[in-house]
Interface confidence: low
C-alpha cells in the first residue's frame, strides 16, 4: 500500500493550563527569542478581579511553566498577588515588570522571568510607562490617589521619586522630535481645565520646563504632531462655547486649526496622523461626524468624507447599547498598513446599526472615496449579482460591528506591513453591512476582493503573508483552515481529536513565523485554558528562489498604479509558488514618480467634494465663511494673484508635470 503522506502541519505543543480565568494576555518577547509570557486574569470590567496566574514558555509555546508562586509579597505575607497587567521593556527584551492590582508592590525580572524580585513601592502602580531607549527608566502613575501622582524610577522600578501631582495624562517625548528624557504632562488646574507642560529634567528645574498650552480640555502626542482641544467661550453667541483643535507639527508652537463648518463642533478625534497629514473626525451637535484632512502642518482642514461612523462615550452614539462595551472613543476608520494613502472607512446613515452602515475606500489619502467592488463569485463559485450602479457593494466590519456582535466577535480588518497589499476582513455583500458575514480577501490593497471563507472566522497570517490560517467562529471545532495562495484555495488540518471552543488564533507580531497559536477551552461545562502550537513550515515546503517572486505595484480600483504621485514596486511571492519567504525576508521596494492626475489632488481649503461621489469634483463649500475664489485685498491693477481652482496637491504626493498639474494647481490671474 502507498505510504501515508505526512501531515504538512504539525501540532508541536498542546498545553492544558487547568486555569479558568476569563482573559489571557499574551506577549512574545521577540528578537528571535523563544520566550512567551501569558497572564491569565479576570476581565477588568468585572468587579475587583480576585486572582491571576502568570505562565512563561521558554520553547516558543510547546510548554508553559506557571510562575505565580514567584510573585509573592515576601516572608510572613500569605496574601495572593493579583496581577492586572505586566510590562515589557522596549529597550531590553529580557526585562518585564508585573504590577499588583491592589497592593503597592511590583516584581521585576532582568532574565525572562527566571528570577523575579519583589519591591514595596510608595504608590499603586496602575499605569507604568517604560522608556523606549533607556532600559532603567520608567514612569509610574497612581490614578487611585486623590492627588493623581506621577512617579519616576531610574533603576527599573526598585526605587521611586514623585515628580508631579494632579496629573491627567503623561507621556515620554518621541525620538527624534524631542530631546532624550523629555516628559509631557497634562496637569489638572483648579479651573477644571489642564495645562500641558514639557520637561527635560523630570521637573527638577524651572528653566528646563516649558508650558506648551493652557486651558486645555484634552492633549495627545502623536509622532511629529501635538494635538490639544480648548473650549472657547463665544461672546454674544447663542451657543455658549465651542471646541477648538490646536496643533503643533515638528514641535513648533501650537496654533488653532481651521475647519470649514458652520455647525457647532462638539468633539475632535484624531483618526490618523501617520503620513505627514492629519485625518480628524469632527463630531457636530447634530450627532453627525465628518472626516477632515489637513495639509502637512495640520492647521488647515478640508472636508474629506461626510457621515463617518464615530462613537464617543457621552457623545455620538452614547445613547446606544454600545455604551456598555466601549469606554473609549473610536472611529470606524482603518489605515491599510504597508502602503501609503489607502484607508477604509464606514459611513453611517441614521442610528448605529448594521442596516445603516456602508464601507468606502480611498487610494489617494482621502482625496476621493468609493464603495468597495463586491467579488464576482462566492467561495463556492456561484455568481454574485452585486452592481455598484444598483447601490450594492462590499462592506467590511470594523470596531462598531465587533461591539454589536459580542457573541461572534467580528475580527478586525487585517493589514500589515509584513504583507503589503494583502487584506483580510469580515464583511458582507449588499446595500449595507447587515447581510450574512463571510471572510473576504484582497491581494490588491482593496482594489479587488474575493470571498474566501463562508461565515465568520478567526484569521491571521505568517511567513510575511505566505500562509493564511483561519478557524470558524461560534462553534466547537478542531479544524484549522490554511491557504498558501493568498486565500484562493484552502486546505483543512485537524488540530485535535476532540473539537474545542476557540477564543483566538495568533502568531508572533511581525507575522514572520510559521508557528500559530490556538487559544481555546476543551472542558465541556467549565472553561479551562488550552493552548495549542501549530507549525505550518512544511505546508510551504522549501525556501523560495528568485523565480518564485514577481514584481507587484498597488493600484486603485481602476488599475491606476500611480498612487500619491508615485509607482511603488514590491517584490512579492507569486501566490501559486509553494515555498517560504523565511523569517529574514527583506521585501525590496522601488519607487518612481508619475505625472500628475486628478487622484493626486484633494479639495482645497474652502472646497468640498461634490455630493455625487462619482463626479470627483471639488465645489465651493457653502459652510465656508470666506470667499473661495475672491482675489486678495488689495489686488493692484496690473499685478497677478494665484486663483485656486478648488484643488490642492495631497501632502506627500510626489507627482510632477502632466496637463492636470497646470489645470488643477490654480493659475496666476490678473487682478480685476
Amino acid at each position: 500500500s502507498a505510504a501515508l503522506q505526512p501531515e504538512p502541519i504539525k501540532v508541536y505543543g498542546q498545553v492544558s493550563l487547568n486555569d479558568s480565568h476569563n482573559q489571557m494576555v499574551v506577549h512574545w518577547a521577540g528578537e528571535k527569542s523563544n520566550v512567551i509570557v501569558a497572564l491569565a486574569r479576570d476581565s477588568l470590567a468585572l468587579a475587583r478581579p480576585k486572582s491571576s496566574d502568570v505562565y512563561v514558555s521558554y520553547d516558543y509555546g510547546k510548554s508553559f511553566k506557571k510562575i505565580s508562586d514567584k510573585l509573592n509579597f515576601g516572608l510572613g505575607n500569605r496574601s495572593e498577588a493579583v496581577i492586572a497587567q505586566f510590562y515589557h521593556s522596549p529597550a531590553d527584551n529580557k526585562r518585564y515588570i508585573f504590577a499588583d492590582a491592589y497592593a503597592q508592590y511590583l516584581w521585576i525580572t532582568f532574565d525572562f522571568c527566571n528570577t523575579l524580585q519583589g519591591f514595596s513601592i510608595p504608590f499603586r502602580a496602575a499605569d507604568l510607562l517604560l522608556h523606549s531607549k533607556a532600559s532603567n527608566l520608567l514612569l509610574g502613575f497612581d490614578r487611585s490617589h486623590p492627588n493623581k501622582q506621577l512617579w519616576k524610577s531610574d533603576d527599573f522600578g526598585q526605587t521611586w521619586i514623585m515628580i508631579q501631582e494632579h496629573v491627567k495624562s503623561f507621556s515620554w517625548g518621541i525620538d527624534p522630535y524631542d530631546k532624550p528624557n523629555t516628559i509631557y504632562i497634562e496637569r489638572h488646574e483648579p479651573s477644571g481645565y489642564s495645562t500641558v507642560f514639557r520637561s527635560t529634567d523630570f521637573f527638577q528645574s524651572r528653566e528646563n520646563q516649558e508650558v506648551i498650552l493652557e486651558e486645555v480640555r484634552d492633549f495627545q502626542l502623536r509622532d511629529k504632531y501635538m494635538f490639544a482641544t480648548k473650549v472657547v467661550h463665544l461672546l454674544g453667541s447663542e451657543q455658549q462655547s465651542s471646541v477648538q483643535l490646536w496643533v503643533s507639527f515638528g514641535r513648533k508652537p501650537m496654533r488653532a486649526a481651521q475647519f470649514v463648518t458652520r455647525h457647532p463642533i462638539n468633539e475632535y478625534y484624531i483618526a490618523d496622523a501617520s503620513e505627514d497629514q492629519v485625518f480628524v473626525c469632527v463630531s457636530h451637535s447634530n450627532n453627525r461626524t465628518n472626516l477632515y484632512i489637513s495639509e502637512a502642518e495640520g492647521l488647515k482642514f478640508s472636508l474629506s468624507l461626510e457621515n463617518v461612523l464615530y462613537y464617543s462615550p457621552g457623545g455620538a452614539g452614547s445613547d446606544t447599547l454600545v455604551r456598555y462595551f466601549a469606554n473609549e472613543p473610536f472611529a470606524d476608520f482603518h489605515r491599510v498598513e504597508g502602503l501609503q494613502g489607502v484607508y477604509i472607512a464606514t459611513l453611517i446613515n441614521g442610528s448605529m446599526n448594521e442596516e445603516n452602515m456602508r464601507s468606502v475606500i480611498t487610494f489617494d489619502k482621502g482625496g476621493t472615496w468609493e464603495f468597495l467592488q463586491a467579488p464576482a463569485f462566492t467561495g463556492y463559485g456561484e455568481k454574485i449579482n452585486c452592481e455598484l450602479s444598483q447601490g450594492c457593494s462590499l462592506h467590511l466590519a470594523q470596531r462598531l460591528s465587533q461591539l454589536l456582535n459580542l457573541q461572534l466577535r467580528r475580527m478586525p480588518i487585517l493589514s500589515k506591513e509584513s504583507a503589503p497589499g494583502l487584506i483580510i476582513a469580515t464583511g458582507s455583500v449588499g446595500k449595507n453591512l447587515a447581510s450574512k458575514t463571510n471572510v473576504y480577501i484582497s491581494s490588491s490593497a482593496g482594489a479587488r476582493w474575493r470571498e474566501a471563507l463562508p461565515g465568520p472566522h478567526y484569521y491571521t497570517w505568517g511567513d510575511h503573508g505566505g500562509i493564511i490560517t483561519a478557524i470558524a467562529q461560534g462553534m466547537e471545532t478542531n479544524e484549522l483552515k490554511y491557504s498558501t495562495n493568498e486565500g484562493e484555495t484552502w486546505k483543512t488540518f485537524i488540530f485535535s481529536e476532540k473539537p474545542v471552543f476557540v477564543y483566538g488564533l495568533l502568531t508572533e507580531p511581525g507575522e514572520k513565523s510559521t508557528v500559530f497559536t490556538i487559544f481555546g477551552s476543551n472542558k465541556e461545562n467549565v472553561h479551562s485554558w488550552l493552548i495549542l502550537q501549530v507549525n505550518a513550515t512544511d505546508a510551504l515546503g522549501v525556501p523560495c528562489t528568485e523565480n518564485d517572486y514577481k514584481l507587484w505595484s498597488p493600484s486603485d480600483e481602476r488599475g491606476n498604479e500611480c498612487l500619491l504621485g508615485h509607482k511603488t514596486v514590491f517584490k512579492r511571492r507569486t501566490p501559486h509558488a509553494t515555498c517560504f519567504n523565511g523569517e529574514d525576508f527583506d521585501r525590496p521596494v522601488v519607487v518612481s514618480n508619475c505625472s500628475c492626475t486628478r487622484e493626486d489632488y484633494e479639495c482645497d481649503f474652502g472646497f468640498k467634494m461634490s455630493e455625487d461621489l462619482s463626479l470627483e469634483v471639488c465645489v465651493p463649500d457653502p459652510e465656508f465663511s470666506g470667499k473661495s475664489y475672491s482675489p486678495p485685498v488689495p489686488c493692484p491693477v496690473g499685478s497677478t494673484y494665484r486663483r485656486t481652482r478648488g484643488y490642492r496637491k495631497i501632502s506627500g504626493d510626489t507627482c510632477s508635470g502632466g496637463d492636470v498639474e497646470a489645470r488643477l494647481e490654480g493659475e496666476l490671474v490678473p487682478c480685476p
Epitope: G250, K252, D276, P632, T640, Y641, R642, G652, T654
Partner: antibody, heavy 113, light 112 residues
Framework: QVQLQQPGAELVKPGASVKMSCKAS????????MHWVKQRPGQGLEWIGT????????SYNQKFKGKATLTVDTSSSTAYMQLSSLTSEDSAVYYC??????WGQGTSVTVSS | DIVMTQAAFSNPVTLGTSASISCRSS???????????LYWYLQRPGQSPQLLIY???NLASGVPNRFSGSESGTDFTLRISRVEAEDVGVYYC?????????FGGGTKLEIK
C-alpha cells in the same frame, strides 16, 4: 513677476531702533511666508526668522529673539522687520525672502554714532 | 541647530570646464515625506542671493541646465558642467528642513 523691494540703506545710532520694509508684488502676499536673513560684511548668511502674512504667525531664530520683530501689513503687501537696541554687531545687509526662493535687494544698516 | 559645512574656496577652474562645490550637513536632511530639503544659492558680487537648486536637484526657474545637484547621505554636491564668466560668485548651501534654517559658510568660485 515676483518682486521684493527694500530700501537701499539706513544709518542709525547705537541704542536706537530701525524698522525696514519689504514690499512684495507679483504674487499673492498672504500665500507665502516671508523670511529675513542677515549678512555681515564679507560674511555668510544667517536666518533671522519668518512670518506667515495670512495670520502674522512668527517664528524666530533663538539668537534674534528680542532683537528682531517681524510684522506685516497685508493691505499694502509689505513685510517689516524692526531691530532694537542696535550695536555695531547689527551693522549688516538684511534681506527679505519670499519662501526662500525670491529675494529682495537687501537693506544695508550701518550703526554708527 | 543643523550645521552646514562648506570649503571657503573652490579649486580654480578654467572657463568652459566643469566645477563642483561640496557641502556637508550635520544631520540627514531627508523628511519623512521623501523630500530632502537642501537648497543651493549663488550670490554674485554686489547682488542678493539667487536660488539655483531646490530640494537637492531641482533647477529653479531661469537657471541654465549647466547646473545640477546630487546627494550622498549628508554630503551634497553642486556641479557646473561648463563654467561661464557669469558663474563667478559665492555659492551657499542651506537646509530648510528644520528651524532655524542654516546656511553653509559659502564657497567662492575662482576662475584661473
Amino acid at each position: 513677476q515676483v518682486q521684493l523691494q527694500q530700501p537701499g540703506a539706513e544709518l542709525v545710532k547705537p541704542g536706537a531702533s530701525v524698522k525696514m520694509s519689504c514690499k512684495a508684488s507679483g504674487y499673492t502676499f498672504t500665500s507665502y511666508w516671508m523670511h529675513w536673513v542677515k549678512q555681515r560684511p564679507g560674511q555668510g548668511l544667517e536666518w533671522i526668522g519668518t512670518i506667515d502674512p495670512s495670520d502674522s504667525y512668527t517664528s524666530y531664530n533663538q539668537k534674534f529673539k528680542g532683537k528682531a520683530t517681524l510684522t506685516v501689513d497685508t493691505s499694502s503687501s509689505t513685510a517689516y522687520m524692526q531691530l532694537s537696541s542696535l550695536t555695531s554687531e547689527d551693522s549688516a545687509v538684511y534681506y527679505c525672502s519670499s519662501s526662500m526662493d525670491y529675494w529682495g535687494q537687501g537693506t544695508s544698516v550701518t550703526v554708527s554714532s | 541647530d543643523i550645521v552646514m559645512t562648506q570649503a571657503a574656496f573652490s579649486n580654480p577652474v578654467t572657463l568652459g570646464t566643469s566645477a563642483s562645490i561640496s557641502c556637508r550637513s550635520s544631520k540627514n536632511l531627508l523628511h519623512s515625506n521623501g523630500i530632502t530639503y537642501l537648497y543651493w544659492y549663488l550670490q554674485r558680487p554686489g547682488q542678493s542671493p539667487q536660488l539655483l537648486i531646490y530640494r537637492v536637484s531641482n533647477l529653479a526657474s531661469g537657471v541654465p541646465n549647466r547646473f545640477s545637484g546630487s546627494e550622498s547621505g549628508t554630503d551634497f554636491t553642486l556641479r557646473i558642467s561648463r563654467v561661464e564668466a557669469e558663474d563667478v560668485g559665492v555659492y551657499y548651501c542651506a537646509q530648510l528642513l528644520e528651524l532655524p534654517y542654516t546656511f553653509g559658510g559659502g564657497t567662492k568660485l575662482e576662475i584661473k
